[in-house]
Each structure stands twice: as C-alpha cells, then as structure tokens.
Interface confidence: medium
Amino acid sequence: PEPPTACREKQYLINSQCCSLCQPGQKLVSDCTEFTETECLPCGESEFLDTWNRETHCHQHKYCDPNLGLRVQQKGTSETDTICTCEEGWHCTSEACESCVLHRSCSPGFGVKQIATGVSDTICEPCPVGFFSNVSSAFEKCHPWTSCETKDLVVQQAGTNKTDVVCGPQDRLRA
C-alpha cells in the first residue's frame, strides 16, 4: 500500500507512518514503528503539556515570583500551566500577568479611599479635619481623632492630618 501523506486527528506522520500523538500531560519518548505504539511518559512534577503532542520535553510551570508581586491563583497540573495573579496591592502589567506593578501607598496625612484592584491603582484622599493618618500604607484609611471628652479628658494638643489629638486630665481648681 501507498505510504500515507496525511494522518488522522491526534496522529502525526513520521517515517511514512502515522503515529499516535501523546495525550496532554505526557511527552514523547519514542515514535511508533511498524510493530510498536508511540511511547509516552507523564510529565514530571512542576511540568505540563496542554495539547496532544509529540514534544520530547514538557514545559516548566510558570513561577509566580513574589519578588515581582506575583502569587499563585491556580496551581498547575500535568495538563495546565500555573496561573499567576498579583498580591493584594499590586496589579498585572499584562494579560499574561508576567509581573505586577506595585500600587502606591498613601503617605502620612492621606488615607486610602479605595484599595487597589487588579486594574486600578490605590486612590488616596487627604485626611479631613477630625481625621489623621500617621502611616504610609496601601490599605489604611484616615482614622478619626480620639474623642477626649468621652474619656472625661481634655485636649492638650490639637490633632493634625498626620497626628492624633493628645488628651490630658482636666485642670482641677484648688480651694
């Protein structure tokens, strides 16, 4: 019979012969022959192949590098790659999420109006009168000044947008 010039789906042509492709999650060890089937082996740990293939090496799972602000969203299998996403406070620089951009922290005197999302930066707002922030944070809102009155104390030092009020004891009139 004439040697085939094309093969069925999930087959490949080699040495004028149609061999079965390896299934996802497996790599090619040896091509089929007239007498033997295609030999395939499962991918190792931290490796994958996501298609019917004739690859002799599996692909390494993507590494979600925390140094780039990445974390694992979905762990890879022998048939799928690891999916990375950004740590809270970071957002992806591309659809493939190969690295993240650090969202800005709000400086003292400013609080977080909206925590960063995967697509938007931190929105900071100045602390209004009666509120303060003494930290540099990607998460903290402005905090209200301490109410001295509710503690039966008086304001000894006024608060600012960066500092809380300082409360002290009420002056007692001596007889």
């Epitope: 003494n134 944070s137 998460f139 903290e140």
Partner: nanobody, 116 residues
Framework: EVQLLESGGGLVQPGGSLRLSCAAS????????MRWVRQAPGKGLEWVST????????YYADSVKGRFTISRDNSKNTLYLQMNSLRAEDTAVYYC?????????WGQGTLVTVSS
Amino acid sequence: EVQLLESGGGLVQPGGSLRLSCAASGFTFSVYDMRWVRQAPGKGLEWVSTISSSGTYTYYADSVKGRFTISRDNSKNTLYLQMNSLRAEDTAVYYCAKYPKNFDYWGQGTLVTVSS
C-alpha cells in the same frame, strides 16, 4: 540599619501549631505594611500573608486561608504568624518582609518542618 529577625520555627507534627515572630529594627515599624513569604525546599518564593500598618487589614494566600493568622504588635516592633492545622506542604523557610519594598532586606528566615 534595617533588620528583620525571624524566630519560632521548628519540627511539628501534621495538625500541630506554631507561632512565628519577626522582630524589626532600624526603621519605624508601625508605619509600614508587612508580609510573610516562604520558600519550600527546592521551590521558589511563595507569598503567605500581608498585614496593614495598624493591623486593620489582613490578606492571605488561598493555601493558608483559615489556618494561618497574621498579626502585629507595634509597641514591640514585632510581626507574628500563628500557624494552625499545619500540613506537610507548609514545610518551608519563612521570611518576613517590609511592604511595599521588594526584598531589599532579608532576615535569615526560620525553618518550619511539618512531619510525623
């Protein structure tokens, strides 16, 4: 000079608990968000948890959610990680790090081994 000194690691059986500490010095600890990361033997770094400067906001990797609790004591300049229901896959060297800086400053880490 910024210093981060992790402690509290050790050998623990599966299902057991440990509390890690990170003593910070050389910077105003209470002003910064902080985080824990870990590195399992032969693996890359993995983010574990983040806590905001006052401790109001906390975030966790899915792999530790419900089992680990991050906290801080700003008066003691110390960051903590309470680890419960430990599993073999939690075996790693644990590091604390100042957020948002990437890893400019490293402690020596503390090794947690979960094994029966």
